[in-house]
Interface confidence: low
């Protein structure tokens, strides 16, 4: 479905899993959850983009929510695709390490 969240991309959740492809819904991009498993494709809901989770196991597809774009999790496993939802792009978790 199409989500009409913020016009930014979500940042990674503290439990979201890492992903190579991040999927997002709203106008932002979601970030990974801290406990989510790593994924190649991360899925999220809002208009943001998801980021990998710090403790989640590695996965190929991660799901997230907002309209933002996800940011990397500090301990999340590697992933190729991250999925998020809102129209924004996710940002990293509060404890996530700096992104390169």
């Amino acid at each position: 479905g199409v989500t009409s969240a913020p016009d930014t991309r979500p940042a990674p959740g503290s439990t979201a899993p890492p992903a190579h492809g991040v999927t997002s819904a709203p106008d932002t991009r979601p970030a990974p959850g801290s406990t989510a498993p790593p994924a190649h494709g991360v899925t999220s809901a809002p208009d943001t983009r998801p980021a990998p989770g710090s403790t989640a196991p590695p996965a190929h597809g991660v799901t997230s929510a907002p309209d933002t774009r996800p940011a990397p999790g500090s301990t999340a496993p590697p992933a190729h695709g991250v999925t998020s939802a809102p129209d924004t792009r996710p940002a990293p978790g509060s404890t996530a390490p700096p992104a390169h």
Epitope: D7, V22, R49, T68, H80
Partner: antibody, heavy 128, light 112 residues
Framework: QVQLVESGGGLVKPGGSLRLSCAAS????????MSWIRQAPGKGLEWVSY????????YYADSVKGRFTISRDNAKNSLYLQMNSLRAEDTAVYYC?????????????????????WGKGTTVTVSS | DIVMTQTPLSSPVTLGQPASISCRSS???????????LSWLQQRPGQPPRLLIY???NRFSGVPDRFSGSGAGTDFTLKISRVEAEDVGVYYC?????????FGGGTKVEIK
């Protein structure tokens, strides 16, 4: 070889419909977010629509909202753009584009958010 | 929406000489994750666009080192240290920090 091949373009009258297709090969299509980006004759680039790797999340430019629908079939490695109520201003070359969000390794994730693979485009002409 | 403004519109350059293209965004492109998702694309005549630079200054695979990107916040620059004949085309900046994704109007690089 990583490749995106668009098809389905053509000449259509205002108010008409077209369905564009994009065949992906050389990479794991279901891992990537995809977008449609268009370029009117002699003009710049305009992002049209975006779809998450699973197909659950979709975004549209205001200029096409309510008229265009993006979808994908990961089993067929294909991306689609259903275009209805076409207008003269929709005339453009439509590109199928792969977006790389980044990768994670060793507990660290690195985000890119870049458009790294572009098809050659398919031309849509809306004219009476 | 974030508006991307490029200057100049056209840049006639002598072969072997440097070229510089500016891109300014209507608001900061720094994402909440600390990254700045600003890319540069090259479109040669009759071809689709091609990624050159991502996240301000990172050269994409296969891109010659004569291309470099710099900037921060709202002001960004693409530089070609020594223009070659194959560099002729239109260059676009693009932001991927926020939806809708938006592009600059393009700068045409041509040989004098």
């Amino acid at each position: 070889q990583v490749q995106l091949v668009e098809s389905g373009g053509g000449l259509v009258k205002p108010g008409g419909s077209l369905r564009l297709s994009c065949a992906a090969s050389g990479f794991t299509f279901s891992d990537y977010y995809m977008s449609w980006i268009r370029q009117a004759p002699g003009k710049g680039l305009e992002w049209v629509s975006y779809i998450s790797s699973s197909g659950t999340t979709k975004y549209y430019a205001d200029s096409v909202k309510g008229r265009f629908t993006i979808s994908r079939d990961n089993a067929k490695n294909s991306l689609y753009l259903q275009m209805n109520s076409l207008r003269a201003e929709d005339t453009a070359v439509y590109y199928c584009v792969r977006e790389n969000l980044g990768y994670c390794t060793g507990g660290n994730c690195f985000y890119y958010y870049y458009m790294d693979v572009w098809g050659k485009g398919t031309t849509v002409t809306v004219s009476s | 929406d974030i508006v991307m403004t490029q200057t100049p519109l056209s840049s006639p350059v002598t072969l072997g000489q440097p070229a510089s293209i500016s891109c300014r965004s209507s608001q900061s492109l720094v994402h909440s994750d600390g990254n700045t998702y600003l890319s540069w694309l090259q479109q040669r005549p009759g071809q689709p666009p091609r990624l050159l630079i991502y996240k301000i200054s990172n050269r994409f695979s296969g891109v010659p080192d004569r291309f470099s990107g710099s900037g921060a916040g709202t002001d960004f620059t693409l530089k070609i240290s020594r223009v070659e004949a194959e560099d002729v085309g239109v260059y676009y900046c693009m932001q991927a920090t926020q939806f809708p994704l938006t592009f600059g109007g393009g700068t045409k690089v041509e040989i004098k």
